[in-house]
Interface confidence: low
Amino acid sequence: LPKAPVITTPLETVDALVEEVATFMCAVESYPQPEISWTRNKILIKLFDTRYSIRENGQLLTILSVEDSDDGIYCCTANNGVGGAVESCGALQVKMKPKITRPPINVKIIEGLKAVLPCTTMGNPKPSVSWIKGDSPLRENSRIAVLESGSLRIHNVQKEDAGQYRCVAKNSLGTAYSKVVKLEVEVFARILRAPESHNVTFGSFVTLHCTATGIPVPTITWIENGNAVSSGSIQESVKDRVIDSRLQLFITKPGLYTCIATNKHGEKFSTAKAAATISIAEWSKPQKDNKGYCAQYRGEVCNAVLAKDALVFLNTSYADPEEAQELLVHTAWNELKVVSPVCRPAAEALLCNHIFQECSPGVVPTPIPICREYCLAVKELFCAKEWLVMEEKTHRGLYRSEMHLLSVPECSKLPSMHWDPTACARLPHLDYNKENLKTFPPMTSSKPSVDIPNLPSSSSSSFSVSPTYSMT
């Protein structure tokens, strides 16, 4: 007798590993024999699709090599024309051992930056990712975290983070390890020991000592008054990523010596500098013996302070006077960043006019020193506190690069404007008068040791030092 189809073994959920075989069974009782069709996610599976095998009159569907895209709902439908068609459905859950789809790669990074080592994984159940550094599991902390993606993020990379890393993906089906990758941490060049300034007698030997570190180990070059060192012997040694350079000099003239440590990070370089001055005791010769020439100031640092097209004295005891004097004022200028807003413009004016002295052209170009009164005004009024601190530090030897020894004049040795008004230079940028000064807050308990000159206001003043001063 004809009998409508009945599915005697309903489809069940099938778990299958990738690349393995998965079979659904749909046992049907009916007469006549039914026609059985299969669907995946409601799309008909074609009989000639070579990825599948359909046997036992359609009752067995086999996926020959499971792919992760085979996940879904599979249904069999049986129909023999007697009664209605019957259907049974079951799910295929594709299980997958962990697989690392984006492994970590070697990284070179500069200390202090953020490093991310990728480790993207696949797997079902979703694998958890951990990391191994060297032979030990890597522990997370406030800087080091394993992200949800599995990537390793290291904030503010430190030297000790350098090493060999691998990620480990694990689920209930197995474990996958990435290849070992290298994290290299590069460190900007840094000077550990700066050369010290010396005040020596003419013809003596001096050794300047400069120590630097970095990864890769930096190279050290020495600059004398803005140019590569032309004389003197250099000895170098490297130990534990520290380079030690000693420059031995025979002193015949004062100079500014700069130690420059440089290392390379990819296409870029990092440099660190430290400078020392070599001054010669009894070097302050009479002005007429000064060797130099007059030229227009072409630098940058003193642009706002010196008069436009000012004629300044360039000292040929330096190999490159413009460069050396500019470097000198630049270094001293940096030390002024910390002084009070009352002191700073006055000190800048004093510095620039002292290092780039006004020049009197003639058969023998002569530098014109600053008038004593202006120097004392800066020292005892505008910068009283700062001057005291600086002198104290000088006595105690606290200045590492004693630039100020060259940069700050000794007021008492300067000529007074009352002796010969043409023998010394005024500071046009200190636009003060006795009326203005009365309103200044007291800077020191002692009165200035000089009567501050009553000068007409300078029309070319870039800034005025008064209760309401400005600087351009």
């Epitope: 979703k126 958890s128 951990s130 599991p137 890597l138």
Partner: antibody, heavy 121, light 112 residues
Framework: ELQLVESGGGLVQPGGSLRLSCAAS????????MSWVRQAPGKGLEWVSA????????YYKESVKGRFTISRDNAKKTLYLQMNSLKSEDTAVYYC??????????????WGQGTLVTVSS | QTVVTQEPSLSVSPGGTVTLTCGLS?????????PDWYQQTPGQAPRALIY???SRHSGVPSRFSGSTSGNKAALTITGAQPEDEADYYC????????????FGGGTKLTVL
Amino acid sequence: ELQLVESGGGLVQPGGSLRLSCAASGFTFDDYGMSWVRQAPGKGLEWVSAIPWNGGSTYYKESVKGRFTISRDNAKKTLYLQMNSLKSEDTAVYYCAKRSGRIAFGALDAWGQGTLVTVSS
Amino acid sequence: QTVVTQEPSLSVSPGGTVTLTCGLSSGSVTSSNYPDWYQQTPGQAPRALIYSTNSRHSGVPSRFSGSTSGNKAALTITGAQPEDEADYYCALYMGSDIRNYVFGGGTKLTVL
């Protein structure tokens, strides 16, 4: 305030089963690995099991492997320890502990007050 | 099997300094073992003190410090207080498997 509260302990016969729970509050539960640590009466601490933030893998002390199952439900902010085939040597206070990072590996920086499991006939 | 070793008991006077050590029955303790230290007072749950050799957990007083010296990890209490009387446990990772997180037997510290 960060809190870990264990429950589910009690008296059970050898060969029996228990399921311990640990309810977490005061922190982002699904950002941290978790662990179970036990302490037999009058004895020291003993690490038992660990699970990372996403539950994707599990770790067990060799002597409990195959008998204990650690799991977590991040939606419910709860950690579980299913203990089967219990032995008298499993008698201990069981502490739930939070790890210091996402993975199962890390210092145990917060602990619950513990729940006592007694295995005895 | 390698065992994590600690002094069974130590005592210190209030205000004094004491050092607890954590070693291995064979081999040396290094920073790769990530030594952790826990404090447990009677009837209470353990509390984290030091992790990864020398990092203090938040809220832990500065008198507690960690280090490795010689072939052991060490916990030093400088200026011990009566409330520091407790059991102290160190824990080490033994190799690259997370299952090898092993606690020492503990040190009972008495503040006399």
